[in-house]
């Protein structure tokens, strides 16, 4: 009597995550009578994958009808494969009994699963930093297999070199994750800049996956301040302007102080953008010189994006302007502001 053979023709099978895998198994003889079972792994810790007689195996189906008389094909199909399904699968013949006795195992078929990396997610610093400071961006992608992957960082199309990348876990696993940190030196021109994290993997059809972050979320460009006096008007009023230039973001509060006393407070809003993404703002104050005996110290105080206030002062020389007789009206503080 010829010895029963359990034939698993493929040593290895590779499938893409989400696809179905067919694991082939045939037996050389109908005798002895007894069931076939499929296991993943060998030894005492092996996992039952399919048993025709009992159990609920929603993703596993028999390729042929195993209840048919003279059936010798016990191949199975596993649907919706995930990286967690990777492993070596054994087709095992049992002799019918109470309990059934394991008779012979196939040589095993190694199932390898290729899985695409998830879309890279780029996150920037929690708080804004000013130009000439270095900030870190992090890029993460998960769930890919095999482990080999390349990750590159770009700022405005130029590859970044100050990068640290880790693929986890270090050892063998069903799937892997990558995490990379890039350090980026900010400049005042970076409001419109973008960093891109680019991930390439064998499963991607030639096009790397990209994650992006805008440096506008990470940068603060502090304003330049300039206070100037316009020429004296015929009505004895001096126009003093405070030019606040090249700042980002727009969140800005400007306060005029006359001799240390608050004269007017304004909030920037709906400013047009400069080409580089920054903003400018000009505010002015009309000072009635005839209302003052002494020189007037005007201060333009700017609080930008919650940072400590920046001041720029200017003295209006009252002695340089002729006083109106009997005039004792308060300084004008109803100036208008112009938004550039």
């Amino acid at each position: 009597e010829e010895e029963l053979q359990v034939i698993q023709p493929e040593k290895s099978v590779s499938v893409a995550a989400g696809d179905s895998a067919t694991l082939n198994c045939t037996v050389s003889s109908l005798i002895p009578v007894g069931p076939i079972q499929w296991f993943r792994g060998a030894g005492p810790g092996r996992e039952l994958i399919y048993n025709l007689k009992e159990g609920h195996f929603p993703r596993v189906t028999a390729v042929s009808d195993p209840t048919k008389r003279n059936n010798m094909d016990f191949s199975i199909r596993i649907s919706n494969i995930t990286p967690a399904d990777a492993g070596t699968y054994y087709c095992v013949k049992f002799r019918k009994g109470s309990p059934d006795v394991e008779l012979k195992s196939g040589a095993g078929t190694e199932l390898s699963v290729r899985a695409k990396p998830s879309a890279p997610v780029v996150s920037g610093p929690a708080v804004r930093a000013t130009a000439e400071h270095t900030v870190s961006f992090t890029c993460e992608s998960h769930g890919f297999s095999p482990r080999d992957i390349t990750l590159k960082w770009f700022k405005n199309g130029n590859e970044l070199s100050d990068v640290q990348t880790n693929v986890d876990p270090a050892g063998k696993s069903v799937s892997y994750s990558i995490r990379s940190t890039a350090r980026v030196l900010l400049t005042r021109r970076d409001v419109h800049s973008q960093v891109i994290c680019e991930v390439a993997h064998v499963t991607l059809q030639g096009d790397p996956l990209r994650g992006t972050a805008n440096l506008s979320e990470a940068i603060r460009v502090p304003p330049f301040l300039e206070v100037t006096q316009q020429s004296m008007r015929a009505d004895n009023q001096v126009n003093v302007t405070c030019q606040v230039t090249k700042f980002y973001p727009q969140r800005l509060q400007l306060t005029w102080l006359e001799n240390g006393n608050v004269s007017r407070t304004e909030m920037a809003s709906a400013l047009p953008e400069n080409k580089d993404g920054t903003y400018n703002w000009t505010s002015w104050l009309l000072v009635n010189v005839s209302a003052h005996r002494d020189d007037v110290k005007l201060t333009c105080q700017v609080e930008h994006d919650g940072q400590p206030a920046v001041n720029k002062s200017f003295s209006v020389k009252v002695s340089a302007h002729p006083k109106e007789q009997g005039s004792n009206t308060a300084a004008e503080n109803t100036g208008t502001n112009e938004r550039n």
Epitope: A16, D148, A200, H201, V202, T203, G206, D207
Partner: antibody, heavy 116, light 109 residues
Framework: VQLVESGGRLGQPGTSLTLSCTVS????????MGWFRQAPGKGLEYIGI?????SPYYASWVNGRFTISKTSTTMDLKMNSPTTEDTATYFC?????????????WGPGTLVTVSS | DIQMTQSPSSLSASVGDRVTITCRAS??????LAWYQQKPGKAPKLLIY???FLYSGVPSRFSGSGSGTDFTLTISSLQPEDFATYYC???????????FGQGTKVEIK
């Protein structure tokens, strides 16, 4: 699933020539496609690929001698200024469904002869 | 660029023989290696991908092994239709470029 190359002919050195690879049974927007060549009696040589989105990538030796592009059903290889050394059979091929590391479907090839 | 060195460049064998062809990469390509069979005037045909996975429809007498830099294609029992030229092809996941070995011609002894 089928690939068929066309455009191979006898050409003059320096006169540009365009080869086409017409595909059927699948979408060019889903797979990387490649161009390869084989000089008479020699081995296979990789020229370049075009990604599913249409980005071309070339072998380091190409240096602008070839341009790969595609439409919805054809992939083209333009030989910009061919020399006699470009005489070969040119093959187009499609990468496998599991990844870009191998090519499972090939066209029969088209012969280009560059001669004065 | 990665170089692929295939050996031997040619061999003579008889039907039923076990044939082994090797391919060595100049640097590690992990398991990104494919084997093709080509007959005169025809396009290459994929036999093995990922170093050891048999492509569908390819007879089980063909097998591949190896990883890193050293790879082997084995034909366990040579058949008349197996007389052809065999090429290895690498893919490098960092440069994302392909390189072929120079080919091995299997002839009838």
């Amino acid at each position: 699933v089928q690939l068929v190359e066309s455009g191979g002919r006898l050409g003059q050195p320096g006169t540009s020539l365009t080869l086409s690879c017409t595909v059927s049974g699948f979408s060019l927007s889903s797979y990387v496609m490649g161009w390869f060549r084989q000089a008479p009696g020699k081995g296979l040589e990789y020229i370049g690929i075009i990604s599913s989105s249409g980005s071309p990538y070339y072998a380091s030796w190409v240096n602008g001698r070839f341009t790969i592009s595609k439409t919805s059903t054809t992939m083209d290889l333009k030989m910009n200024s061919p020399t006699t050394e470009d005489t070969a059979t040119y093959f187009c091929a499609r990468v496998g469904p599991l990844g870009v590391d191998y090519f499972n479907i090939w066209g029969p090839g088209t012969l280009v002869t560059v001669s004065s | 660029d990665i170089q692929m060195t295939q050996s031997p460049s040619s061999l003579s064998a008889s039907v039923g023989d076990r044939v082994t062809i090797t391919c060595r990469a100049s640097q590690s390509i992990n398991s990104y290696l494919a084997w093709y069979q080509q007959k005169p005037g025809k396009a290459p045909k994929l036999l093995i991908y990922s170093a050891s996975f048999l492509y569908s429809g390819v007879p089980s007498r063909f097998s591949g092994s190896g990883s890193g830099t050293d790879f082997t294609l084995t034909i366990s029992s040579l058949q008349p239709e197996d007389f052809a030229t065999y090429y290895c092809q690498s893919w490098h996941y960092i440069s994302r470029s392909y390189t072929f070995g120079q080919g091995t011609k299997v002839e009838i002894k």
